[in-house]
């Protein structure tokens, strides 16, 4: 028969022969022959391969370096890489999460729209009219101005995006 020029799924072509790929979690030791199946070996401790493959070496699991603020979110297996995340108060600098930076704080006049996670930074938003933030914080949202009316008080000093209104007693001499 004519030697193949293409192979089925989960096979590869080597020297005019279709050989089975090694399953995830295993590496290639020896190509198949007409008489012998592809020889594969399981990846060692702290190694993985996550696809059907013909790799002769497994990949090393990612190391979550605590010196870079990293910790293990999900331990790797022979078929999956380790997933790192950042320590509390820090987030990844990239999708690959190779290092961490401190969550940013929202300055006075800005509130937290979305609290940071291990993989995303704090999202701040300017405090709209009627709201304020007078602190630098990674958690505080913009607070609404105090409603003087509900306390039977009047506004003595208008609020800003950084300060609350100041309420005071009503002028009793007023008709």
């Amino acid at each position: 028969p004519e030697p193949p020029t293409a192979c089925r799924e989960k096979q590869y072509l080597i020297n005019s022969q279709c050989c089975s790929l090694c399953q995830p979690g295993q590496k290639l030791v020896s190509d198949c022959t007409e008489f012998t199946e592809t020889e594969c070996l399981p990846c060692g401790e702290s190694e993985f391969l996550d696809t059907w493959n013909r790799e002769t070496h497994c990949h090393q699991h990612k190391y979550c370096d605590p010196n870079l603020g990293l910790r293990v979110q999900q331990k790797g297996t022979s078929e999956t890489d380790t997933i790192c995340t950042c320590e509390e108060g820090w987030h990844c600098t990239s999708e690959a999460c190779e290092s961490c930076v401190l969550h940013r704080s929202c300055s006075p006049g800005f509130g937290v729209k979305q609290i940071a996670t291990g993989v995303s930074d704090t999202i701040c938003e300017p405090c709209p009219v009627g709201f304020f933030s007078n602190v630098s914080s990674a958690f505080e949202k913009c607070h609404p101005w105090t409603s003087c009316e509900t306390k039977d008080l009047v506004v003595q000093q208008a609020g800003t995006n950084k300060t609350d209104v100041v309420c005071g007693p009503q002028d009793r001499l007023r008709a």
Epitope: N15, S30, C32, T33, E34, F35, T36, E39
Partner: antibody, heavy 117, light 109 residues
Framework: QVQLVESGGGVVQPGRSLRLSCAAS????????MHWVRQAPGKGLEWVAV????????YYADSVKGRFTISRDNSKNTLYLQMNSLRAEDTAVYYC??????????WGQGTMVTVSS | EIVLTQSPGTLSLSPGERATLSCRAS???????LAWYQQKPGQAPRLLIY???ARANGIPDRFSGSGSGTDFTLTISRLEPEDFAVYYC??????????FGGGTKVEIK
Amino acid sequence: QVQLVESGGGVVQPGRSLRLSCAASGFTFGSYGMHWVRQAPGKGLEWVAVISYEGVKKYYADSVKGRFTISRDNSKNTLYLQMNSLRAEDTAVYYCARDTSRGHDIWGQGTMVTVSS
Amino acid sequence: EIVLTQSPGTLSLSPGERATLSCRASQSVSYDYLAWYQQKPGQAPRLLIYGASARANGIPDRFSGSGSGTDFTLTISRLEPEDFAVYYCQQYADYPPFTFGGGTKVEIK
């Protein structure tokens, strides 16, 4: 460890039969093709036969075709060579060897077959 | 059928010397599927080199294989006492039959 052990050799008269066995251990026997190779006294190596891992494909050297039959029992991790109509020129040490894309990587210690009247 | 011719038939050398063994094929060996084996008296052959130039597991680096097509060479850079043996080349690309060369005996001078 990975090992092949041949047995069944001996002295036999011309025209008679003999069955050689090769017991495998230390590896997944059912994933490998297997060969028989022989060596006449004081001579070089001569390939005899090969069988595929599942026993479907078999090839023979012209010198033994029609007289020798290679077979295997994967449940017993054993390879066989049935030798019929033996001749004086079949006298040799018979080795079994494992097939890989790297050549014959594991060999047994051999079993001696002497065909003599 | 691919015929393999090995030369010389016998090589007489002293320990520490370099040994160069030749294997010539009657036609090109596809994919360089050529192996070298070592055999000592009363023992089974042992795989040394496969794919013309790759060392098998546990084989010392003083053994090296080279060549392609029809001309192949096994070199032992510095002969050790345990290297005196018979060496066979074998092609496993074109079969049946899988063919062996006639062998080269490396003996102590």
